[in-house]
């Protein structure tokens, strides 16, 4: 009789995770009598996958009924494949004995498992940054196989080029992970912007997975401050407003100081949003001019999103002549948007009326 050969026709088989894998094996002879065993790997550490004669292998079923007369088909089907099942499988013929004696092995079939990447998770910087600064976003996806994968970054639909990507591990593995870091330059208009990480893989049939992050979580837009003053009212009161403009996020505290003393503190809440996602807020202060003998220095102090306070100062000039009271006040917007305060005195003639 011809010498027994164990034939594994496929060198490799690729299966999607969750599916069943069929590993084919046939013997060319009924002789010698003895069982087939399937192993993953070779050598002393090889893993027994199926033993025709004995054992319990719940995920493995023989393709052909082992009790079928003259059976020479020793193919098996492994159900519910996971990436951990990847490896090279060997169909090995044993000669009946006590114990059975290994006789001949097939050439092996490499099982590769196609596993989908997990949904990409995009994380932004831990602390907010202001316009013109560069922030980093990280995208991670795990558990995919094979190793080949494509990752792209987009900001508002425009592809980004400043990013670095790593796929781990570098060597062979049952599954892989990808991590990519993109650098994004912020602008004041980015409150409504979004970054997208897009992952394409053979298992996704051309329908890439996307992870997103909103730049609103990463950006801080500091406010502009402006003073306005209405003319003297009949009751010797002047209405001064501090306009806080184009800021994000909403978290903001405004303090009025009269001659350095805290007059009122307010917290911004439930503000309407501008089109660009920023907020405006106007706070007003009524200054009773008749209660002051000297000029009143008003300061609008804004603390935005836990940052150092921004001050804007304003002088309300009070006339020394009682007969002119009620009409001889002047106020001048002398502040700047810089942190700290600036106070510029008006000219020395306190009798002049300055209307700005």
């Amino acid at each position: 009789e011809e010498e027994l050969q164990v034939i594994q026709p496929e060198k490799s088989v690729s299966v999607a995770a969750g599916e069943s894998a069929t590993l084919n094996c046939t013997a060319t002879s009924l002789i010698p009598v003895g069982p087939i065993q399937w192993f993953r790997g070779v050598g002393p550490g090889r893993e027994l996958i199926y033993h025709q004669k004995e054992g319990h292998f719940p995920r493995v079923t023989p393709v052909s009924d082992p009790t079928k007369r003259n059976n020479m088909d020793f193919s098996i089907r492994i159900s519910n494949i996971t990436p951990a099942d990847a490896g090279t499988y060997y169909c090995v013929k044993f000669r009946k004995g006590s114990p059975d004696v290994e006789l001949k092995s097939g050439a092996g079939t490499e099982l590769s498992v196609r596993a989908k990447p997990s949904a990409p998770v995009v994380s932004g910087p831990a602390v907010r940054a202001t316009a013109e600064h560069t922030v980093s976003f990280t995208c991670e996806s795990h558990g995919f196989s094979p190793r080949d994968i494509t990752l792209k970054w987009f900001k508002n639909g425009n592809e980004l080029s400043d990013f670095q990507t790593n796929v781990d591990p570098a060597g062979k593995s049952v599954s892989y992970s990808i991590r990519s870091t993109a650098r994004v330059v912020l602008t004041r208009r980015d409150v409504h912007s979004q970054v997208i990480c897009e992952v394409a893989h053979v298992t996704l049939q051309g329908d890439p997975l996307r992870g997103t992050a909103n730049l609103s979580e990463a950006i801080r837009v500091p406010p502009f401050l402006e003073f306005t003053q209405q003319s003297m009212r009949a009751d010797n009161q002047v209405n001064v407003t501090c306009q806080v403009m184009k800021f994000y996020p909403q978290r903001l505290q405004l303090t009025w100081l009269e001659n350095g003393n805290v007059s009122r503190t307010e917290m911004a809440s439930a503000l309407p949003e501008n089109k660009d996602g920023t907020y405006n807020w106007t706070s007003w202060l009524l200054v009773n001019v008749s209660a002051h003998r000297d000029d009143v220095k008003l300061t609008c102090q804004v603390e935005h999103d836990g940052q150092p306070a921004v001050n804007k100062s304003f002088s309300v000039k009070v006339s020394a002549h009682p007969k002119e009271q009620g009409s001889n006040t002047a106020a001048e917007n002398t502040g700047t948007n810089e942190r700290g305060s600036s106070d510029y005195k008006d000219d020395d003639d306190k009798h002049h009326h300055h209307h700005h």
Epitope: E1, L30, I31, V33, G34, H51, Q52, K53, E54, G55, D65, P66, T67, K68, R69, N70, N71, K96
Partner: antibody, heavy 119, light 110 residues
Framework: QVQLVQSGAEVKKPGASVKVSCKAS????????INWVRQAPGQGLEWIAM????????HYNQIFKDRATLTTDTSTSTAYMELRSLRSDDTAVYYC????????????WGRGTLVTVSS | DIVLTQSPDSLAVSLGERATINCRAS??????????IFWYQQKPGQPPKLLIY???NLDSGVPDRFSGSGSGTDFTLTISSLQAEDVAVYYC????????FGQGTKLEIK
């Protein structure tokens, strides 16, 4: 290693039935045929029937088709052979044997169960 | 059904001598290139033991003084050098169709 342990000797009256058991161990019971063979005192071997425990497919020797029934209990890896309407010439040692190569041969044998039919 | 006829019914051979037992089938037991003949040895008070499968293949643990040959309808079991422990009854069996046994050959020492 493969072992087939058979039930003990039986004495039966003509017309009665006997059920002989064969408990298998050392291998996957459902992967191999079980044969039943008998041997009358001083006589040769006579094949009765065979059963596939995986699906209870059976093949019978025509001589025994009407009187013998083979069954298995896969939960206990036990095969049974029942012979009905016993006659005195059914007195024999009844063997179970496992077919290891699916060649319809008998690779491993039980030690036999003596069934004596006598009035 | 295939009928197997063994010859001789009994045989006496001197220790160390060759013993030959024949088995003839009423029709060919060959299929797909294999000859479906098996040989068994049965010692007193013991179950039979498989010696040869598919006409010429020694079962595991069987001494190599035993051999099988033949094809089609005529088959032979040979013991090249008889040992005392070889005293037994020898049966051929076919499985080209459903199993049947030959009537057996009793081997004794001369």
């Amino acid at each position: 290693q493969v072992q087939l342990v058979q039930s003990g000797a039986e004495v039966k009256k003509p017309g009665a039935s006997v059920k002989v058991s064969c408990k298998a161990s050392g291998y996957t019971f459902t992967n191999y045929w079980i044969n039943w063979v008998r041997q009358a005192p001083g006589q040769g071997l006579e094949w009765i029937a065979m059963i596939d425990p995986s699906d209870s497919e059976t093949h019978y020797n025509q001589i025994f088709k009407d009187r013998a029934t083979l069954t298995t209990d896969t939960s206990t890896s036990t095969a049974y052979m029942e012979l009905r309407s016993l006659r005195s010439d059914d007195t024999a040692v009844y063997y179970c044997a496992m077919d290891y190569g699916s060649l319809y041969a008998m690779d491993y044998w039980g030690r036999g169960t003596l069934v004596t039919v006598s009035s | 059904d295939i009928v197997l006829t063994q010859s001789p019914d009994s045989l006496a051979v001197s220790l160390g001598e060759r013993a030959t037992i024949n088995c003839r089938a009423s029709k060919s037991v060959s299929s797909s290139g294999y000859n479906y003949i098996f040989w068994y040895q049965q010692k007193p008070g013991q179950p039979p033991k498989l010696l040869i499968y598919l006409a010429s293949n020694l079962d595991s643990g069987v001494p190599d003084r035993f051999s099988g040959s033949g094809s089609g309808t005529d088959f032979t079991l040979t013991i090249s050098s008889l040992q005392a422990e070889d005293v037994a009854v020898y049966y051929c069996q076919e499985s080209r169709e459903l199993p049947t046994f030959g009537q057996g050959t009793k081997l004794e020492i001369k």
